[in-house]
């Protein structure tokens, strides 16, 4: 028997359902009574879901997993994981034992898009060229940790005097706060880009300083 899984990680958005694909080649005369199928966490060997003795033994993992029972006899041992959480991320092993045995591991990569950044300025009034200002770019509820880039109005990267912090909330999602300290010119635009490295999703925010008032 040969077990096959996708070589590329399965990317799943938080709160959506994901399918971890696994297939095996049934031998001639194969019946489900012969099948011992185990899905487990690769690293800890924690049982996730199993099918044995001709019966779906159910989820051993937060009651959020399911097989495709009608497709098992054809060799489809895929696992459905419902309402994906950050903590589900990792490697899952599909183990099939019939007359022969085989196993293979598939990676689940969890992702969540970042919100459109909000921009704040400090101080936010009585600004004059030569003043030092702090521009804060905040984006919320993303996963995994973001990459943050600052540019000026001409598209030139601003790398000095940037401090970025990322804090995970109780669901494991990150809130990003990036602070740029700059000396004001006569006028200018400052933009921040928050990138989700898994989704290749970019969220943009900018602030334009033209004396008064400010444009966000």
């Amino acid at each position: 028997v040969e077990v096959q899984v996708s070589e590329d990680p399965v990317v799943a958005l938080v709160d959506t359902d994901a399918t971890l694909r696994c297939s095996f080649s049934p031998e001639p005369g194969f019946s489900l009574a012969q099948l011992n199928l185990i899905w487990q966490l690769t690293d800890t060997k924690q049982l996730v879901h199993s099918f044995t003795e001709g019966r779906d033994q159910g989820s051993a993992y937060s009651n959020r997993t399911a097989l495709f029972p009608d497709l098992l006899v054809q060799g489809n041992a895929s696992l459905r994981l419902q309402r994906v959480r950050v903590t589900d991320e990792g490697s899952y092993t599909c183990f099939v034992s019939i007359q022969d045995f085989d196993s293979a591991a598939v990676s689940l990569q969890v992702a969540a898009p970042y919100s459109k950044p909000s921009m704040t300025l400090e101080p936010n009034k009585d600004l004059r060229p030569g003043n030092m200002v702090t521009i804060t770019c905040s984006s919320y509820q993303g996963y995994p940790e973001a990459e943050v880039f600052w540019k000026d109005g001409q598209g030139v990267p601003l790398t000095g005097n940037v401090t970025t912090s990322q804090m995970a909330n109780e669901r494991g999602l990150f809130d990003v706060h990036s602070v740029l300290r700059v000396v004001l010119g006569a006028n200018g635009t400052y933009s921040c880009l928050v990138r989700n490295p898994v989704l290749q999703q970019d969220a943009h925010g900018s602030v334009t300083i033209t004396g008064q008032p400010l444009t966000f």
Epitope: E27, T52, I98
Partner: antibody, heavy 117, light 108 residues
Framework: DVQLVESGGGVVRPGESLRLSCAAS????????ESWVRQAPGEGLEWVSI????????FYADSVKGRFTISRDNSKNTLYLQMNSLRAEDTAVYYC??????????WGLGTLVTVSS | EIVLTQSPGTLSVSPGEGATLSCRAS??????LAWYQQKPGQPPSLLIY???TRATGIPDRFSGSGSGTDFTLTISSLQSEDFAVYYC??????????FGGGTKVEIK
């Protein structure tokens, strides 16, 4: 008739190596996983290692992990166990056994490995 | 790892009498349990698989029962060739494949 014949046992010193072989006949070798099970003198059975029919997947008991390597040559209908860094506690009769549906339906007669200084 | 505990360690029985051997698993193995017989100087041989199915050529005086964690091998009327060591083995959750410590059935 299914037949499994082990060879390669003998007396070695601690730290030395040994390679066991198991010649299979009477069935389609590549369709079955094969395993090694050992039995220390006067003791019970201990599963050692298993290899899938294709040879692409292997598992080991914790007691031998990193020291023993199971392999197979389907063109020669032969199963192997390479044993390195042998210890006194590895002294046992080593059986090769055919795995089918989770249990062992055929066993060889065994080969004795003695590790002694 | 599933631990299998066999009892008794030794069972003394007269020929013609029955014998009951026990195998207890540390967690459920469903019906994924096999029994083997081993005579002195010989390899083990398969008696029972899937808890209650006799292997090819095994006489019907051997019977297996149980599911979950408690299993029994019954030999209804011991013949001289039945005096041996008997092992149980689980294959529900593996690796590792695990064996019980064995029960020796000896002549009383």
């Amino acid at each position: 008739d299914v037949q499994l014949v082990e060879s390669g046992g003998g007396v070695v010193r601690p730290g030395e190596s040994l390679r066991l072989s198991c010649a299979a006949s009477g069935f389609t070798f590549s369709s079955y996983a094969e395993s090694w099970v050992r039995q220390a003198p006067g003791e019970g059975l201990e599963w050692v290692s298993i290899i899938s029919g294709s040879g692409g997947n292997t598992f080991y008991a914790d007691s031998v992990k990193g020291r023993f390597t199971i392999s197979r040559d389907n063109s020669k209908n032969t199963l192997y166990l390479q044993m390195n860094s042998l210890r006194a506690e590895d002294t046992a009769v080593y059986y090769c056994a055919r795995f089918a549906y989770g249990f062992f339906d055929y066993w060889g007669l065994g080969t004795l490995v003695t590790v002694s200084s | 790892e599933i631990v299998l505990t066999q009892s008794p360690g030794t069972l003394s029985v007269s020929p013609g009498e029955g014998a009951t051997l026990s195998c207890r698993a540390s967690q459920t193995v469903g019906s994924k349990l096999a029994w083997y017989q081993q005579k002195p100087g010989q390899p083990p041989s398969l008696l029972i698989y899937d808890a209650s199915t006799r292997a090819t050529g095994i006489p019907d005086r051997f019977s297996g029962s149980g599911s979950g964690t408690d299993f029994t091998l019954t030999i209804s009327s011991l013949q001289s060739e039945d005096f041996a060591v008997y092992y149980c083995q689980q294959y529900r959750n593996w690796p590792p494949l695990t064996f019980g410590g064995g029960t020796k059935v000896e002549i009383k």
